[in-house]
């Protein structure tokens, strides 16, 4: 009997997408490359449900984890790696006092129960996202 696996081995399925939580650490730009190399994207968050799921994964493992969000192009203007501007409704997820841009902090990470901005050249864990395979057939 052939079973359908919507996600590759060691990836996690959630609401039609597959997520890879890294076990090694890279800087933000290298995390983008790592995701591209496996046909995915450094995670872009599209809903409150997805945010809650990812925040839980990150906080459970007690890891600082890169997401695909930065203000590298224009200070204070946060943009996802797919080009979409950060919706104001998502700003509630920043930890208290963040983003604070202390010492050129231009990349966003999961930190504790929310988001933090940190220096992009720091090595952290990362999360990749890609669409799940269709199991119809």
């Amino acid at each position: 009997e052939r079973l359908c696996h919507p996600c590759p081995w060691e990836w996690t399925f959630f609401q039609g997408n597959c997520y890879f939580m890294s076990n090694s650490q890279r800087n933000w730009h290298d995390s983008i490359t790592a995701c591209q190399e496996v046909g995915a994207q450094l995670v872009v968050i599209k809903s409150a449900e997805e945010q809650n799921f990812l925040q839980l994964q990150s906080s459970r493992s007690n890891r600082f984890t890169w997401m695909g969000l930065s203000d590298l192009n224009h200070e204070g203007t946060w943009q996802w790696v797919d080009g979409s501007p950060l919706l104001p409704s998502f700003k509630q997820y920043w930890n208290k006092g963040e983003p604070n841009n202390v010492g050129e902090e231009d990349c966003a990470e999961f930190s504790g129960n929310g988001w933090n901005d940190d220096k992009c050249n720091l090595a952290k864990f990362w999360i990749c996202k890609k669409s799940a395979a269709s199991c119809s057939g």
């Epitope: 224009h74 996802w80 797919d82 080009g83 501007p85 919706l87």
Partner: antibody, heavy 119, light 107 residues
Framework: QVQLQESGPGLVKPSETLSLTCTVS????????VHWIRQPPGKGLEWIGV???????DYNAAFMSRVTISKDDSKSQVSLKLSSVTAADTAVYYC?????????????WGQGTTVTVSS | DIQLTQSPSFLSASVGDRVTITCKAS??????VAWYQQKPGKAPKLLIY???TRHTGVPSRFSGSGSGTEYTLTISSLQPEDFATYYC?????????FGQGTKLEIK
């Protein structure tokens, strides 16, 4: 200058798929998102969805089950497909450029194309 | 979805008048409001975004203000070319939504 132009059949039969193309000039689809918005006759504006420079899409949940937006960067074209159409999908369909990196609003619009759903 | 209610729906005014159109949101949209002008048979044109930022080339007689759930578009001195329908739009969250429109007519 920045321009967007919608094209496609003006008449679609009920239950069929509406297919429209938006051809852009004066900017690159690798730098900007493009939205689709529609306006039924004599009514207001309704957002359908958007495709971003990185090819990811966001859709209005009201259309989610039957809409697909895609693009071809090399042809500077964005396409809209809306399946299982009914008379309620009769409208002027617009494509519009996202207004930059600071928000989800529309800074340049196409002139619109009228689509009638009728047998 | 966030509902936007514009008032009035119809407005009659004369050239030189100062007019104000209001847009009320069903929840706080934190200044993420844009305004568009549409003339019959034409596509809408962006006037203002982020509540008060005028788009390139928009005359200074157009201004926007507001916060929370209530936003206004003001035209300080109506010109003949300003008679049109005006729409507000929230870009706080998806789905992006519009007001029902305010038709500004010549008195």
């Amino acid at each position: 200058q920045v321009q967007l132009q919608e094209s496609g059949p003006g008449l679609v039969k009920p239950s069929e798929t509406l297919s429209l193309t938006c051809t852009v000039s004066g900017f690159s689809l690798t730098n900007y998102g493009v939205h689709w918005i529609r306006q039924p006759p004599g009514k207001g504006l309704e957002w359908i969805g958007v495709i971003w420079r990185g090819e990811s899409t966001d859709y209005n949940a009201a259309f989610m089950s039957r809409v697909t937006i895609s693009k071809d960067d090399s042809k500077s074209q964005v396409s809209l497909k809306l399946s299982s159409v009914t008379a309620a999908d009769t409208a002027v369909y617009y494509c519009a450029r996202n207004g930059g990196s600071s928000g989800w609003y529309f800074d340049v619009w196409g002139q619109g194309t009228t689509v009638t759903v009728s047998s | 979805d966030i509902q936007l209610t514009q008032s009035p729906s119809f407005l009659s005014a004369s050239v030189g008048d100062r007019v104000t159109i209001t847009c009320k949101a069903s929840q706080d949209v934190t200044s993420a409001v844009a305004w568009y002008q549409q003339k019959p048979g034409k596509a809408p044109k962006l006037l203002i975004y982020w509540t008060s930022t005028r788009h390139t080339g928009v005359p200074s007689r157009f201004s926007g203000s507001g916060s929370g759930t209530e936003y206004t578009l003001t035209i300080s001195s109506l010109q003949p070319e300003d008679f049109a329908t005006y729409y507000c739009q929230q870009h706080y969250t998806t789905p992006l939504t519009f007001g029902q429109g305010t038709k500004l007519e010549i008195k």
